[in-house]
């Protein structure tokens, strides 16, 4: 299904405009900001979501780097250029002709330059580390139960194949979710780990992108898991190219 047929909405993306103008009068939804038709049976790409979000650019993400090759999204929100499939174009430029190269999750991976800057390929982010801190609880969560609950969540809510959740680490109150997805592993139809991480990040911030679904209500054996802060680290298949240490 491409969209909810009865009331013509997009379950997986509230930042859309939907109308029954698809083939055979089927419901079709287009992303705000770009007008690109989206598949409402799966997650919308982060590029299209950021483009739609630019009407209200708030809560820019700041990420912490775990090692010298990890990227920090300290440029905040920008209005991205997306390709016809909704992926980030390798080169992004702003209105003042300042350009830079990005990875598959849209994070800058080179120094800024001018219009002559070349970005030969879109470099894939193949490893994402989601670092969470949960609010104090009476005791620590059972590690196995917590691990299973988070794996279930990524399968059920974000439709991320279980093979892409590499590990769940827990040292109270810190939880780390490792997502890994090489170019060779990602089959047609597979949700991208970058998109799953972005949806999860918005969910834990109380800014769910889903239409008509309740907000994220994480529970481990009935005990609420409330996230205090989220940091996301991105690692690319090819290390970033900066002229000096940032």
């Amino acid at each position: 299904h491409t969209a909810a047929q009865d009331n013509c909405t997009c379950p997986t993306n509230k930042m859309t405009v939907c109308s029954p103008d698809g083939p055979g009068g089927r419901c079709q939804c287009r992303a705000l900001g770009s007008g690109v038709a989206v598949d409402c049976s799966t997650l919308t790409s982060e590029c299209l979501l950021l483009k739609a979000r630019m009407s209200a650019p708030k809560n820019a993400r700041t990420l912490v780097r775990p090692n010298e090759h990890a990227l920090v999204d300290n440029d905040g929100l920008y209005d991205p250029d997306c390709d016809p499939e909704g992926r980030f174009k390798a080169r992004q430029c702003n209105q003042t002709s300042v350009c830079w190269c990005v990875n598959s999750v849209g994070v800058r991976r080179t120094d800024k330059g001018d219009l002559s800057l070349r970005c030969d390929e879109l470099v894939r982010t193949h490893h994402i580390l989601i670092d969470l801190r949960h609010r104090p609880t009476a005791g620590a969560f059972n590690h196995s139960d917590l691990d299973a609950e988070l794996r279930r969540l990524f399968r059920e809510r974000y439709r991320l194949h279980p093979k892409f959740v590499a590990a769940v680490h827990y040292e109270q109150p810190t939880i780390q979710i490792e997502l890994r997805q090489n170019t060779s592993q990602k089959a047609a139809g597979d949700v991208d780990i970058g998109d799953a991480a972005y949806y999860f990040e918005r969910d834990v911030k109380g800014e769910s992108l889903f239409q008509g679904r309740g907000g994220l209500d994480l529970r481990v054996r009935g005990e609420p898991l409330q996230v205090e802060r989220t940091l996301i680290y991105y690692l690319d298949e090819i290390p970033p190219k900066f002229s000096m240490k940032r």
Epitope: S41, P162, K163
Partner: antibody, heavy 117, light 106 residues
């Protein structure tokens, strides 16, 4: 094609334990999840728990904690469920089923367990 | 845990007749899954994500609903559709099934 081949019927005495198997073929074993479901004669389906084959992560329903033990041998592409301290209430057909981005997309043919003295 | 209640428990239909069965959840779920089970066989995934037909399922089957109320419809009953149908959720642990609707042919 995807197949889940379960072990044959078991007749065991009360108080004993039993270990049944679910051999997978036609897919990359460690990429998936194997869930287990109980069905008593003429009754509905009851979920027991699941094991993430790549990480070994296991979740049991409260009712089956201490009753069921889920394991897997990745070298033989086989998942196992052991049931302990058996009573007549454990007599049932037990199914294994593969999980992916769906809870259960392919099912085994079931293993019939009879607990009787 | 989320309790799923199916109704009716047993029903019968003539060939060509439209059949509708329902599944009510004790709290809201994101999607519903439906399985068909024939005597002596294992369950078979019929419908996923509330309304999407699994591979090989005839188009006479359809699913709909949201929140706490879901339904499975067979537009024209056929003899091979005689089976027990189960709804199932996995919006939260533990996964739960409905008690089943047994569909018989008249």
């Amino acid at each position: 094609q995807v197949q889940l081949q379960q072990s044959g019927p078991e007749l065991v005495k009360p108080g004993a334990s039993v270990k049944m198997s679910c051999k997978a073929s036609g897919f990359t074993f460690t990429d998936y999840v194997i869930g287990w479901v109980k069905q008593r004669t003429g009754q509905g389906l009851e979920w027991i728990g699941e094991i993430y084959l790549g990480s070994g992560t296991i979740y049991y329903t409260e009712k089956f904690k201490g009753k069921a033990t889920l394991t897997a041998d990745t070298s033989s592409n086989t998942a196992y469920m052991q049931l302990s301290s058996l009573t007549s209430e454990d007599s049932a057909v037990y199914f294994c089923a593969r999980g992916s981005i769906f809870p259960f997309d392919y099912w085994g043919q079931g293993t019939t367990l009879t607990v009787s003295s | 845990q989320i309790v799923l209640t199916q109704s009716p428990a047993i029903m019968s239909a003539s060939p060509g007749e439209k059949v509708t069965m329902t599944c009510s959840a004790s709290s809201s779920v994101s999607y519903m899954y439906w399985y068909q089970q024939k005597p002596g066989s294992s369950p078979r995934l019929l419908i996923y994500d509330t309304s999407t037909l699994a591979s090989g399922v005839p188009v006479r089957f359809s699913g709909s609903g949201s929140g706490t109320s879901y339904s499975l419809t067979i537009s024209r009953m056929e003899a091979e559709d005689a089976a027990t149908y189960y709804c199932q959720q996995w919006s939260s642990y533990p996964y739960t099934f409905g008690g089943g609707t047994k569909l018989e042919i008249k």
